[in-house]
């Protein structure tokens, strides 16, 4: 009789994760009698994948009916393939015995698993950064195979170049992960901006996965302050306004100081949004000029998003106004949070709202 051959016709097989893999094996002779076993890997540490004679292998089925007479086809089908199934599979013929004796191995079939990358997750800085500063965004995707992958960053559709990307592990593995960091320069116009991490892989059939992050979560746009005096009213009261413009986020506290003493503190809330996503706020203070002998120094102090306070001062000239008798009020604070302040914004910005 001619020598038995164990034939594994495919050197390699590539399968998408979740699919079934067929590993082909035929023998050239019914002689000698004895079982076929399938192993992953070679040598003493090899892993038994299927043994026709005995054992429970729920994911593995014989392609041909093993009880069929003259059967020389010992191909197997492994269901629900995962990246962990990657490796080289050997079809091994044994001679019947007590125990069965290994006789001959096929050349092996390398199973590679095409696994899709997970949806990219983009994370920004833990704390907000002020506009005109640079912040880092990271993008992570896991579980893909093969290792080749392309990752691109975009800001408002424009590709970013200050990017550092790593694919791990460096050596052979059943699956891989990618981590990329992009450095993004924030501008005052970036409240509505978005960064996109785009991942392209052979398993995605040209339809890349995208992860996004809104710069609104990362940016702080500090306010501009302007304090102005309206014309004197007939009752000797001067209306002083503090215009706080183009800030983000909304978290802002405004304090009026008269000659260094706190007159009123207000918190911004439910402000309408400008087109660019920033906010404006106008607060006013009525100063009774006739109650003062000397000029009054008014200070509008703004604390924005937990940052150090910013001040803008304005002097109301008392000497220019005749003193009215019988008044003992230094400054009249008619404003509550609602009545004492008015929302200032351009008409252009009226109907634009910002969503987080």
């Amino acid at each position: 009789e001619e020598e038995l051959q164990v034939i594994q016709p495919e050197k390699s097989v590539s399968v998408a994760a979740g699919d079934s893999a067929t590993l082909n094996c035929t023998v050239s002779s019914l002689i000698p009698v004895g079982p076929i076993q399938w192993f992953r890997g070679a040598g003493p540490g090899r892993e038994l994948i299927y043994n026709l004679k005995e054992g429970h292998f729920p994911r593995v089925t014989a392609v041909s009916d093993p009880t069929k007479r003259n059967n020389m086809d010992f191909s197997i089908r492994i269901s629900n393939i995962t990246p962990a199934d990657a490796g080289t599979y050997y079809c091994v013929k044994f001679r019947k015995g007590s125990p069965d004796v290994e006789l001959k191995s096929g050349a092996g079939t390398e199973l590679s698993v095409r696994a899709k990358p997970s949806a990219p997750v983009v994370s920004g800085p833990a704390v907000r950064a002020t506009a005109e500063h640079t912040v880092s965004f990271t993008c992570e995707s896991h579980g893909f195979s093969p290792r080749d992958i392309t990752l691109k960053w975009f800001k408002n559709g424009n590709e970013l170049s200050d990017v550092q990307t790593n694919v791990d592990p460096a050596g052979k593995s059943v699956s891989y992960s990618i981590r990329s960091t992009a450095r993004v320069l924030l501008t005052r116009r970036d409240v509505h901006s978005q960064v996109i991490c785009e991942v392209a892989h052979v398993t995605l059939q040209g339809d890349p996965l995208r992860g996004t992050a809104n710069l609104s979560e990362a940016i702080r746009v500090p306010p501009f302050l302007e304090v102005t005096q309206q014309s004197m009213r007939a009752d000797n009261q001067v209306n002083v306004t503090c215009q706080v413009t183009k800030f983000y986020p909304q978290r802002l506290q405004l304090t009026w100081l008269e000659n260094g003493n706190v007159s009123r503190t207000e918190m911004a809330s439910a402000l309408p949004e400008n087109k660019d996503g920033t906010y404006n706020w106008t607060s006013w203070l009525l100063v009774n000029v006739s109650a003062h002998r000397d000029d009054v120094k008014l200070t509008c102090q703004v604390e924005h998003d937990g940052q150090p306070a910013v001040n803008k001062s304005f002097s109301v000239k008392v000497s220019a106004h005749p003193k009215e008798q019988g008044s003992n009020t230094a400054a009249e604070n008619t404003g509550t949070n609602e009545r004492g302040s008015s929302d200032y914004k351009d008409d252009d910005d009226k109907h634009h709202h910002h969503h987080h």
Epitope: L30, N51, K53, E54, D65, P66, T67, R69, N70, K96
Partner: antibody
Framework: QVQLVQSGAEVKKPGASVKVSCKAS????????INWVRQAPGQGLEWIAM????????HYNQIFKDRATLTTDTSTSTAYMELRSLRSDDTAVYYC????????????WGRGTLVTVSS | DIVLTQSPDSLAVSLGERATINCRAS??????????IFWYQQKPGQPPKLLIY???NRDSGVPDRFSGSGSGTDFTLTISSLQAEDVAVYYC????????FGQGTKLEIK
């Protein structure tokens, strides 16, 4: 280690039925044919039938086609052979045997079950 | 149906001598490049034991003094040097179609 353990001896009256069991161990029961063979006292071997436990496909010797029924219980890895309308010449040792090479041969044998048919 | 006829029915051979048992099929048992003949040994009070499969292949654990030969319709089991423990009845079986056995050959020591 492949083992086939058969049920104990039976004494039956003519016209009765007998059901012999064969419990398999040491291998995957559904992957190999089970044959039944009998041997009358001082006589040769006579093949009765075979069954594939995976799908209960059976092949019978024409002589026994109308009187023998093979079944299996895969949950207990047990094969059964029932012989009906017993006659005195059915007195024999009944063997189960496993076909390890799918060659329609008998590689591993049970110890046999003696069935005596006597009035 | 294929009928197998063994010869002789019984045989006495001296220890250390060659024993030869023949099996003739009523039609060829060759198919798919194989001769579908098997040889069994049965000792008193024991089940049969497979010796040779597909005409010429010793089963595992079978001493190499046992050999099988033949093709088509005529087959031979040979014991090259008879040992005391070889006393038994020997059966041929075919599986070209559904199995049948030869009538058996009783081997004794002369």
């Amino acid at each position: 280690q492949v083992q086939l353990v058969q049920s104990g001896a039976e004494v039956k009256k003519p016209g009765a039925s007998v059901k012999v069991s064969c419990k398999a161990s040491g291998y995957t029961f559904t992957n190999y044919w089970i044959n039944w063979v009998r041997q009358a006292p001082g006589q040769g071997l006579e093949w009765i039938a075979m069954i594939d436990p995976s799908d209960s496909e059976t092949h019978y010797n024409q002589i026994f086609k109308d009187r023998a029924t093979l079944t299996t219980d895969t949950s207990t890895s047990t094969a059964y052979m029932e012989l009906r309308s017993l006659r005195s010449d059915d007195t024999a040792v009944y063997y189960c045997a496993m076909d390890y090479g799918s060659l329609y041969a008998m590689d591993y044998w049970g110890r046999g079950t003696l069935v005596t048919v006597s009035s | 149906d294929i009928v197998l006829t063994q010869s002789p029915d019984s045989l006495a051979v001296s220890l250390g001598e060659r024993a030869t048992i023949n099996c003739r099929a009523s039609q060829s048992v060759r198919s798919s490049g194989y001769n579908w003949i098997f040889w069994y040994q049965q000792k008193p009070g024991q089940p049969p034991k497979l010796l040779i499969y597909l005409a010429s292949n010793r089963d595992s654990g079978v001493p190499d003094r046992f050999s099988g030969s033949g093709s088509g319709t005529d087959f031979t089991l040979t014991i090259s040097s008879l040992q005391a423990e070889d006393v038994a009845v020997y059966y041929c079986q075919h599986s070209r179609e559904l199995p049948t056995f030869g009538q058996g050959t009783k081997l004794e020591i002369k």
